[in-house]
């Protein structure tokens, strides 16, 4: 029987116009060297920022071995979408797919790619492309992990105390202060996935003037400063 | 283990055909896509066509077709290539590879067989 | 068609030295982050042995010796450090399409 798990690739694109392209495919190497130790199925996590253009690929399987493409998709809340392609009949289906914004690439018979235009939270989820050939089938799962860019802002609201949020993330930001102070930090869920970090930081020591906010995230890091008056300051705010 | 056996040696006058077995074994036959490829004396490697076992697919190279014919007997796990028309410069050695899944990589090959046309 | 261009034709190497061919085609062999590109070797009087496959992935058995790289339309292979047995043609071949090879490069060992 076939090696099954050869693994589903992510395209890297160029960038599209004013929309940025995600480069998710695998790196060649690491994928033939997972096909060549016959693992079994490994789920692969893979982030993507939101509002991208994601391309995802199937393994390195020529039209002429195969018999039937299929990518299974599944995600949060919603019935698991298929989209096949069968040779034989030059056919494909559909079943339960209702995202307009992920389609194949091409016709299939050309290219098994699947894309996502502007990637939005609710393509959080599990991609599967098998490829059904005489010998078995190949296939690699995927979780596609969605990443929300958070705001971050920085101000203080009574004698020598300092807030920092992060605002609307995915996942959570981590916040650390420079110097450390004496701080408190709550994490908000919302309901669409994304989560709010706010780090309240005290600073008894009177000669710390300058206190840092130090934000970090899968999408990138960002630092504030603020200098520490006797009254409430100014409002600093900024995106990664 | 894998195993591609070709038939032997021919030598064909021109304007003859000449068919070249090729038989498999070490996996199911039908499932794996077979190439044939020549070798005229002192050159290299130039692909014929392809067939697929298992649906009975043929691709051949636009230089061979009208001449060359390949075809299968899953019976006997056996491929054959039949080219016709024989000329001078079909002499060559003429091998079967078996194309794996993955990348398209043809990881196992006949021993050759050597076609000789000569009047 | 796609074309493949090998370069050099021949090539005289000492043991321990490297060899690098080059193998040029007449358009992209890449797609979906894949490069369609193999490498065989020939010895005479044998079939050929697949090398390298998709570029840069070396066959199970072949010597660390060997590598492959780049994408698109253009590729490498490299022997180093070359040994006497290494005498042999080289061939790409490509499976983007219908399968093609190119002309060959003859590697012999001073």
């Known amino acids: 029987a076939a090696q099954p798990n050869n693994s589903l690739m992510l395209q890297t694109s160029k960038e599209n116009h004013a929309l940025a392209s995600s480069s998710l495919c695998m790196d060649e190497k690491q994928i033939t060297q997972n096909y060549s130790k016959v693992l079994a199925e490994v789920n692969t996590s893979w982030p993507v920022k939101m509002a991208t253009n994601a391309v995802l690929c199937c393994p390195p399987i020529a039209l002429r071995n195969l018999i039937i493409i299929t990518w299974e998709i599944i995600l949060r809340g919603q019935p698991s979408c298929t989209k096949a392609y069968k040779k034989e009949t030059n056919e494909t289906k559909e079943t339960n797919c209702t995202d307009e914004r992920i389609t194949w690439v091409s016709r299939p018979d050309q290219n098994s790619d699947l894309q996502i235009r502007t990637v939005a939270i609710t393509h959080d989820g599990y991609y599967r492309c098998i490829m059904v050939t005489p010998d078995g089938n190949f296939h690699r799962g995927y979780h596609l992990q969605v990443l929300v860019t958070p705001e971050v802002t920085l101000f203080q609201n009574r004698n020598r105390t300092a807030v920092c949020k992060a605002v609307a993330g995915k996942p959570a930001a981590h916040i650390s202060w420079i110097p450390e102070g004496d701080c408190a930090t709550k994490q908000e869920y919302w309901s669409n996935g994304t989560v709010t970090v706010k780090s309240t930081c005290h600073w008894e020591v009177h000669n710390v003037s300058t206190v840092t906010c130090h934000v970090s995230h899968l999408t990138g890091n960002k630092s504030l400063y603020i200098e520490l008056l006797p009254v409430p300051g100014a409002k600093k705010s900024a995106k990664l | 283990q894998v195993q591609l056996v070709q038939s032997g040696a021919e030598v064909k006058k021109p304007g003859a055909s000449v068919k070249v077995s090729c038989k498999a074994s070490?996996?199911?036959?039908?499932?794996?896509?077979m190439h044939w490829v020549r070798q005229a004396p002192g050159q290299g490697l130039e692909w014929m066509g392809y067939?697929?076992?298992?649906?009975?697919?043929?691709n051949y190279n636009e230089k061979f077709k009208g001449r060359v014919t390949m075809t299968r007997d899953t019976s006997t796990s056996t491929v054959y290539m039949e080219l016709s028309s024989l000329r001078s410069e079909d002499t060559a050695v003429y091998y079967c590879?078996?194309?794996?899944?993955?990348?398209?990589?043809?990881?196992?090959w006949g021993q050759g067989t050597l076609v000789t046309v000569s009047s | 068609d796609i074309v493949l261009t090998q370069s050099p034709a021949s090539l005289a190497v000492s043991p321990g030295q490297r060899a690098t061919i080059t193998c040029r085609a007449s358009?992209?062999?890449?797609?979906?982050?894949?490069?369609?590109m193999h490498w065989y070797q020939q010895k005479p009087g044998q079939p050929p042995k697949l090398l390298i496959y998709?570029?840069?992935n070396l066959e199970s058995g072949v010597p660390a010796r060997f590598s492959g790289s780049g994408s698109g339309t253009d590729f490498t292979l490299t022997i180093n450090p070359v040994e006497a047995n290494d005498t042999a043609n080289y061939y790409c071949?490509?499976?983007?399409?219908?399968?093609?090879f190119g002309q060959g490069t003859k590697v012999e060992i001073k």
């Open positions: 998709l570029a840069s």
């Open positions: 070490g996996y199911t036959f039908t499932s794996y896509v």
């Open positions: 590879a078996r194309e794996d899944y993955y990348g398209s990589r043809w990881g196992y």
């Open positions: 067939i697929n076992p298992y649906n009975d697919d043929t």
């Open positions: 071949q490509h499976s983007r399409e219908l399968d093609t």
């Open positions: 358009k992209s062999v890449s797609t979906s982050g894949y490069s369609y």
